[in-house]
């Protein structure tokens, strides 16, 4: 297993609709044809997998059914979008990239993106 640098933004604020997007960029030492991207969430020293996708030569990442993630890729950049976020989902979201093929296998883990989610205030009753 060889190490690889992965860069991602330090902080992202989710939209009022609970959607957060960020770019995960990896420094590929060669021409990988099969890449696996995993988003991990770290909160209270617990790490859980949010979503994962393996992609090849295309620009659309396909996630498992009912995943809260969507994504596209361009070169060594992966554009990730996480949907359905609520305030309780605030935490550090870590991008993990694996170059699966061809050998050698490379693994890179980013420092994480702190995603802040603020639940929208309910609309006040209107007199109109």
């Amino acid at each position: 297993c060889k190490a690889m640098h992965v860069a991602q933004p330090a902080v992202v604020l989710a939209s009022s609709r609970g959607i957060a997007s960020f770019v995960c960029e990896y420094a590929s030492p060669g021409k990988a044809t099969e890449v696996r991207v995993t988003v991990l969430r770290q909160a209270d020293s617990q790490v859980t997998e949010v979503c994962a996708a393996t992609y090849m030569m295309g620009n659309e990442l396909t996630f498992l059914d009912d995943s809260i993630c969507t994504g596209t890729s361009s070169g060594n950049q992966v554009n990730l979008t996480i949907q359905g976020l609520r305030a309780m989902d605030t935490g550090l979201y870590i991008c993990k990239v694996e170059l699966m093929y061809p050998p050698p296998y490379y693994l890179g883990i980013g420092n994480g993106t702190q995603i802040y989610v603020i639940d929208p205030e309910p609309c006040p009753d209107s007199d109109f």
Epitope: T33, E34, T54, Y55, M56, M57, G58, N59, E60, T62, F63, L64, D65, D66, S67, T70, G71, T72, M100, Y101, P102
Partner: antibody, heavy 115, light 106 residues
């Protein structure tokens, strides 16, 4: 030029298993998914699953779990689908298609399950 | 799984006429892709990533849409366009196709 060539049409009895092949040429085999698609007579397209030829990574449509098994032999740039415990409902045309974009398809293999 | 509903299921158009086929997803998808299939042949990639024409596809074909609603348009129908058209999503597994729209020439 890119070409996908499947095995010939097959007639089998219920309960049997069958292996269909998809021989790829004209591109780097390990750089693209191989997808398998089923089409029953007069019906639409159903995605069975896909395999990454380099690593062997597979994804299946749950509807075909236990029915279909995808494999590859990279040395011969050939992908295979094994269909087991065949029933009449498995009678269909089976296609293989290349990559994320399904940009090249083979001509299809007709599988007929009949007693 | 994401269900793609195509409409209409069957339609006819006169040569030179405009044709629009819609594809509605049960959940928002990143892109929709379109295939054309003529009887006895394998499907052919027509449009990918919602609006990009595949190599060799005539410019009378176009695709558009976002979120859950997409469409395929033929600006001027030609006899050779008679076929069944399928939309497809690759946002989540399992990959799914629409039920198809059979387009006949009037």
């Amino acid at each position: 030029q890119v070409h996908l060539q499947q095995s010939g049409d097959v007639l089998v009895k219920p309960g049997a298993s069958v292996n269909l092949s998809c021989k790829a040429s004209g591109y780097t085999f390990t750089s693209y998914w191989i997808n398998w698609i089923k089409q029953r007579p007069g019906q639409g397209l159903e995605w069975i699953g896909r395999i990454a030829p380099g690593s062997g990574t597979t994804y299946y449509n749950e509807m075909f779990t236990g029915k279909a098994t995808l494999t590859v032999v990279t040395s011969s740039t050939t992908a295979y689908i094994q269909l087991s415990s065949l029933s009449f409902e498995d009678s269909a045309v089976y296609f293989c298609a290349r990559g994320d974009y399904f940009d090249y398809w083979d001509q299809g293999t007709t599988l007929t399950v009949s007693s | 799984q994401i269900v793609l509903t195509q409409s209409p299921a069957i339609m006819s158009a006169s040569p030179g006429g405009k044709v629009t086929i819609t594809c509605s997803a049960s959940k928002s998808v990143s892109y929709i892709h379109w295939f054309q299939q003529k009887p006895g042949t394998s499907p052919k990639l027509l449009i990918y990533d919602t609006s990009t024409l595949a190599s060799g596809v005539p410019p009378r074909f176009s695709g558009s849409g976002s979120g859950p609603s997409y469409s395929l348009t033929i600006s001027r129908m030609e006899a050779e366009d008679a076929a069944t058209y399928y939309c497809q999503q690759r946002t989540t597994y399992p990959l799914t196709f629409g039920g198809g729209t059979k387009l006949e020439v009037r």
